[in-house]
Interface confidence: medium
């Protein structure tokens, strides 16, 4: 099984449609489960995010550097939300996100149809074969959702859209 | 809670550059963009560019262009604010601000300030 | 650029009396979302700003409810309903518009 999300980073626009890819190819001649969770950036310091001192922390993140304090750290200390699963033609929306127009396209691309003040984080494609057990089961893109910024506005397409006050 | 710490005073030469780091601690720097704003003394705030560090985007107001760069480390949490070609005018506080995307106009968070004093 | 005129300059209050300060701009900042792209910051003294209200209306987070802001288009105000010793130093209001972002004068807020 092999699993693999092409956009590592996607940044969209708040109110806007997108689509998170995922590709999988596998031995199996089972249907796949196809599941898209949600996890939010990591709220902590980077210390505190792995339960550890600052100093550690540091020293960790100066050795490896792919490790990303905002994206790395213990489910606990961030959201995880299933988004939606498919199995065979049938999609479920998790409960946090019925009533949304998010589907499952291409066998396990997510679509959004209206990006929300909160989708910004990671998310991952994981894919389950009954008799598929080897490799890689699961990929993640991070999603940026922007919306219309006066420090963007002569940069970036100026999209008309709506703020969410706090 | 988001705190900025910014570097501490400098004084300059004209002619000379200075960069000033601001350092971000708490809260998600993935998902927040940083401004400039420097205010000379008894006198009011002047924006001077801002970044969006996940997006490596800077955008600068061209009194400044071409003597002021905004770079944004984020393996760091760190935003830095270089500007070549000091004067005498020059000489101001200047201040980090972090503004929450999906906007990132409204500076909800500053840095305690650098004092970049130019002087022969 | 947008050019920001804030008045009074001085506006000496005394302690429990309501305060208003006027913010105009050089071009509407009615954005077609609906939403006014004007903040309104305050630099207490020897003190960094702080965020008090965002797009023209919106209370920052920990701003007491005696702050408000209002307007649309090119005419803005913010108004204390019963000042405090606390609230004293420098009030700002920025367009957020467009780049540059551009600042008002300021006002500054003293105790009768």
């Known amino acids: 099984l092999q699993v693999t999300v092409p956009d590592k980073k996607k940044v969209a626009m708040l109110f806007q449609p997108t689509v998170l890819r995922c590709h999988f190819s596998t031995s199996s001649h089972q249907p796949a489960v196809v599941q898209w969770k949600f996890k939010s950036y990591c709220q902590d310091r980077m210390g505190e995010s792995l339960g550890m001192s600052s100093t550690r922390a540091q020293s960790l993140s100066k050795r490896n550097l792919e490790w990303d304090p905002y994206l790395d750290c213990l489910d606990s200390r961030r959201t995880v939300r299933v988004v939606a699963s498919k199995q065979g033609s049938t999609v479920t929306l998790g409960d946090f996100y019925r009533g949304r127009e998010i589907t499952i396209v291409h066998d396990a691309d997510l679509q959004i149809g209206k990006l929300m003040w909160g989708d910004s984080g990671l998310y991952y494609c994981i894919i389950t074969t009954p008799d598929d057990l080897e490799g890689k089961n699961e990929d993640s893109v991070e999603l940026l959702v922007l919306g219309r910024t006066g420090l963007l506005a002569d940069l970036l397409p100026s999209f008309a859209v709506e703020i969410m006050p706090e | 809670q988001v705190q900025l710490v910014q570097s501490g005073a400098e004084v300059k030469k004209p002619g000379s550059s200075v960069k000033v780091s601001c350092k971000a601690s708490?809260?998600?720097?993935?998902?927040?963009?940083i401004s400039w704003v420097r205010q000379a003394p008894g006198q009011g705030l002047e924006w001077m560019g801002g970044i969006i560090p996940i997006l490596g985007i800077a955008n600068y107001a061209q009194k400044f262009q071409g003597r002021v760069t905004i770079t944004a480390d984020k393996s760091t949490s760190t935003a830095y604010m270089e500007l070549s070609s000091l004067r005498s005018e020059d000489t101001a506080v200047y201040y980090c601000?972090?503004?929450?995307?999906?906007?990132?106009?409204?500076?909800?968070?500053w840095g305690q300030g650098t004092l970049v004093t130019v002087s022969s | 650029d947008i050019v920001m005129t804030q008045s009074p300059l001085s506006l000496p209050v005394t302690p429990g009396e309501p305060a208003s300060i006027s913010c105009r701009s050089s071009q509407s900042l009615l954005y077609s979302n609906g939403y006014n792209y004007l903040d309104w910051y305050l630099q207490k003294p020897g003190q960094s700003p702080q965020l008090l209200i965002y797009l023209g209306s919106n209370r920052a987070s920990g701003v007491p409810d005696r702050f408000s802001g209002s307007g649309s288009g090119t005419d803005f105000t913010l108004k204390i309903s019963r000042v405090e010793a606390e609230d004293v130093g420098v009030y700002y209001c920025m367009q957020a518009l467009q780049t540059p972002l551009t600042f008002g004068g300021g006002t500054k807020l003293e105790i009768r």
């Open positions: 601000a972090r503004g929450r995307l999906p906007y990132g106009d409204f500076w909800d968070s």
């Open positions: 708490g809260g998600t720097f993935s998902s927040y963009a």
